[in-house]
């Protein structure tokens, strides 16, 4: 019962937190900057990994996608990339886990699939989990970065004087959502690990076969495969212990009249 | 990089019209505000007129109802039209614009200036 609760839990956390992640990768405020207040208009700039927006005071807002810029910076393409990363394992690892649930039967599904199918899926998360946190932790060391080094830059330029308008850069809301749905991808993917413990079989039943010579005198049969699978100097009652899979000339179980002087 | 070039000034005769034009290009992703700013001989830089992306404009008080500030968003260009030019509008005037050229860049920059002279 706790193994199918904690198997649960785990799969709704990772779901709100994959939902999270998907919300922080669309979201437009990943870092906000109160521009500019002259004396036209107070200009609010806010940028996300896909475009970046401007709005007024009167309310006027206008977005633009980067697809219109060259050259954008690797660290943005890192920081994309990480978040789909995170988004693409996220989604197998929830499919992967709906199948998995204890409380869903499939067929004739057994246990130890689906300790081996809630494992997978956990490991996903955690990765999930791990790529959104780094993807946000990412920029917002880009940002930090950039602000210390945006200090009031002032230089001529062709056809004038060009000043970089030293901002406030501040944390956009998608990074809170971003490290938020991270860490509950990872503590879902945890529990999903944990779960799978329960889940496996505790001991692997083995089919024992005992084997026993027919007469005394068992002649020695050199480099035979039999010497290892009961015959030959095997007199006594062993257990030989296989896990079902056998090959083609271990199928014979009995011994033959060649075995015998 | 960002560009502007300033076009337009001259010599005009009291009550005369020009029309100053100021065109930005490099890397620019947004230009939120664009204004004309004026300095006569002797004082202080002022703002003369001043436009938003969203159009909203403000005016210094000695140009209302005689300049009217414009701008071609597609082109990136901005446009001040005077009328009813007075002595007292000689200076040279300078284009302003706030240009947002990718993540954490902003820039204000502005043109070379373009002289203006009012007299007959």
């Known amino acids: 019962m706790a193994v199918t609760a904690c198997q649960g839990l785990g799969f709704v956390v990772s779901l709100i937190g994959i939902a999270g992640i998907i919300a922080a990768t669309c979201m437009d405020q990943w870092s906000t900057q109160d521009l500019y207040n002259n004396p036209v208009t107070a200009v609010f700039n806010y940028q996300g990994l896909w475009r970046s927006c401007v709005r007024e005071s009167s309310g006027f807002t206008e977005c633009r996608g980067y697809f219109t810029l060259l050259g954008l910076p690797a660290m943005l393409q890192a920081v994309r990339a990480l978040m789909i990363v995170g988004i693409v394992l996220g989604a197998i690892g929830l499919l992967v886990s709906i199948f998995a649930l204890k409380c869903i039967r499939i067929g004739s599904m057994e246990d130890s699939a689906k300790a081996n199918m809630t494992l997978t899926s956990g490991i996903m998360f955690i990765v999930s989990g791990l790529c959104a946190i780094a993807g946000v932790s990412v920029f917002a060391n880009m940002l930090v970065t950039n602000f210390w080094m945006s200090t009031a830059n002032m230089y001529t330029g062709m056809g004038g004087m060009v000043q970089t308008v030293q901002t406030r850069y501040t944390f956009g809301a998608a990074l809170f959502v971003g490290w938020v749905a991270g860490g509950l991808t990872l503590i879902g993917g945890v529990m999903m690990c944990i779960a799978c413990r329960g889940l496996a079989p505790e001991e692997t039943n083995y089919k024992a076969v005992s084997y026993h010579a027919s007469g005394h005198s068992v002649a020695y049969k050199p480099g035979g495969f039999k010497a290892s699978t009961g015959f030959g100097s095997n007199t006594k009652n062993k257990k030989i212990y296989d896990g079902g899979a056998r090959t083609e000339d271990e199928v014979q179980s009995y011994p033959s009249k060649h075995d015998y002087v | 990089q960002v560009q502007l070039v300033e076009s337009g000034g001259g010599l005009v005769q009291p009550g005369g019209s020009l029309r100053l034009s100021c065109a930005a290009s490099?890397?620019?992703?947004?230009?939120?505000?664009m204004g004309w700013y004026r300095q006569a001989p002797g004082k202080g830089l002022e703002l003369v007129a001043g436009?938003?992306?969203?159009?909203?404009?403000n005016y210094a008080d000695s140009v209302k109802g005689r300049f009217t500030i414009s701008r071609d968003n597609a082109k990136n260009t901005l446009y001040l039209q005077m009328n009813s030019l007075r002595a007292e509008d000689t200076a040279v005037y300078y284009c302003?614009?706030?240009?947002?050229?990718?993540?954490?860049?902003?820039?204000?920059?502005w043109g070379q200036g373009t002289l203006v002279t009012v007299s007959s």
């Open positions: 490099g890397s620019i992703f947004h230009i939120p505000v």
């Open positions: 302003n614009v706030l240009v947002v050229s990718g993540i954490g860049s902003t820039l204000e920059v």
């Open positions: 436009i938003s992306r969203g159009g909203t404009t």
